[in-house]
Interface confidence: low
């Protein structure tokens, strides 16, 4: 029962976390800028993986991609790619966990069976929450480290350019979502791999010994384990590997009125 | 879509002073950052300023920093360059760049529009 529980609540998890990475990803909130505080010129601009958006006090919003002549910055590229593999996976390991419940019947498929397809499954969680998490990790990096600018190496302070009046750059929600979604991923597929010890009997290779008593005759089952209704070769579970990833690493615009250039 | 047009560029004598315009038309109201590049021959091509459409913001390459100014005329929809106390090492094509985008504006690949370039040629 308590395998059951472990993997349900393993694979209810995963989901929620990979629900979130496909939020952050889409989500426009990567970054924040707040240009101006007051009141009456105020300009918040946001951009994320895909397009940058600005809102104006009036509460008029306008979003446009992220169209460019001679291709994205290797960096932007990374970490779209990061969390697009971190949902393929994630997306994959759904599909298999859900035939790989305790709780679903699938013809005669057979213990052991479940028990390497929720192992397969709790893997690609914890690989699609560690490559989420990286994802957001680089993209965060690169706001602190170079706060402005890619090139950081080419010139000085604000990642090279100098700058005449101060900004303020924030950590948007999406980073925030994404690191919270890849914690439950990479949660709910340690927990399927949890799971998995338990789905796959211990190997008993017993043989059942008849000892006949005057009189009467009894099966002895020797060792004082619980009657089961089989025996056999039983696949014992393999110990669950985990790996860790690290990674790490921009500029900000604005809207110009009708009247700006 | 966004046209640009450069114009100012030509040859002069170290220390001395050039302005170059850019004439923005066409759909504006996006564009968030403008900017001027230059590609010396056989180099890449870098920054040298920008200014924020919506404000005072201006950026300069440590380079051109105290040297050279950037400015706007909304009025107008052109974007200036002052160059003073040239140097023969600001030879090169300048291009005026614009962009929508928010990040990587230091990258060539984050500008969305771009004009044809013109020539700064300083002699010493």
């Known amino acids: 029962m308590a395998v059951t529980a472990c993997q349900g609540l393993g694979f209810v998890v995963s989901l929620i976390g990979i629900a979130g990475i496909i939020a952050a990803t889409c989500m426009d909130q990567w970054s924040t800028q707040d240009l101006y505080n007051n009141p009456v010129t105020a300009v918040f601009n946001y951009q994320g993986l895909w397009r940058s958006c600005v809102r104006e006090s009036s509460g008029f919003t306008e979003c446009r991609g992220y169209f460019t002549l001679l291709g994205l910055p290797a960096m932007l590229q990374a970490v779209r790619a990061l969390m697009i593999v971190g949902i393929v996976l994630g997306a994959i390991g759904l599909l298999v966990s859900i035939f790989a419940l305790k709780c679903i019947r699938i013809g005669s498929m057979e213990d052991s069976a479940k028990a390497n397809m929720t192992l397969t499954s709790g893997i690609m969680f914890i690989v699609s929450g560690l490559c989420a998490i990286a994802g957001v990790s680089v993209f965060a990096n690169m706001l602190v480290t170079n706060f402005w600018m890619s090139t950081a190496n080419m010139y000085t302070g604000m990642g090279g350019m100098v700058q005449t009046v101060q900004t303020r750059y924030t950590f948007g929600a999406a980073l925030f979502v994404g690191w919270v979604a890849g914690g439950l991923t990479l949660i709910g597929g340690v927990m399927m791999c949890i799971a998995c010890r338990g789905l796959a009997p211990e190997e008993t290779n017993y043989k059942a010994v008849s000892y006949h008593a005057s009189g009467h005759s009894v099966a002895y089952k020797p060792g004082g384990f619980k009657a089961s209704t089989g025996f056999g070769s039983n696949t014992k579970n393999k110990k669950i590997y985990d790996g860790g990833a690290r990674t790490e690493d921009e500029v900000q615009s604005y809207p110009s009125k009708h009247d700006y250039v | 879509e966004v046209q640009l047009v450069e114009s100012g560029g030509g040859s002069v004598q170290a220390g001395g002073s050039l302005r170059l315009s850019c004439a923005v038309s066409g759909y504006t109201y996006n564009l968030k950052y403008m900017g001027w590049f230059r590609q010396a021959p056989g180099k890449e091509r870098e920054p040298v300023a920008f200014i924020y459409l919506g404000g005072d913001n201006q950026y300069y390459a440590p380079s051109v920093k105290d040297r050279f100014t950037i400015s706007q005329d909304n009025a107008k929809n052109t974007v200036y360059l002052q160059m003073n106390s040239l140097k023969p090492d600001d030879t090169a094509m300048y291009y005026c760049?614009?962009?929508?985008?928010?990040?990587?504006?230091?990258?060539?690949?984050?500008?969305?529009?771009w004009g044809q370039g013109t020539q700064v040629t300083v002699s010493s």
């Open positions: 760049a614009a962009t929508t985008a928010l990040l990587f504006l230091a990258q060539t690949s984050s500008w969305n529009y």
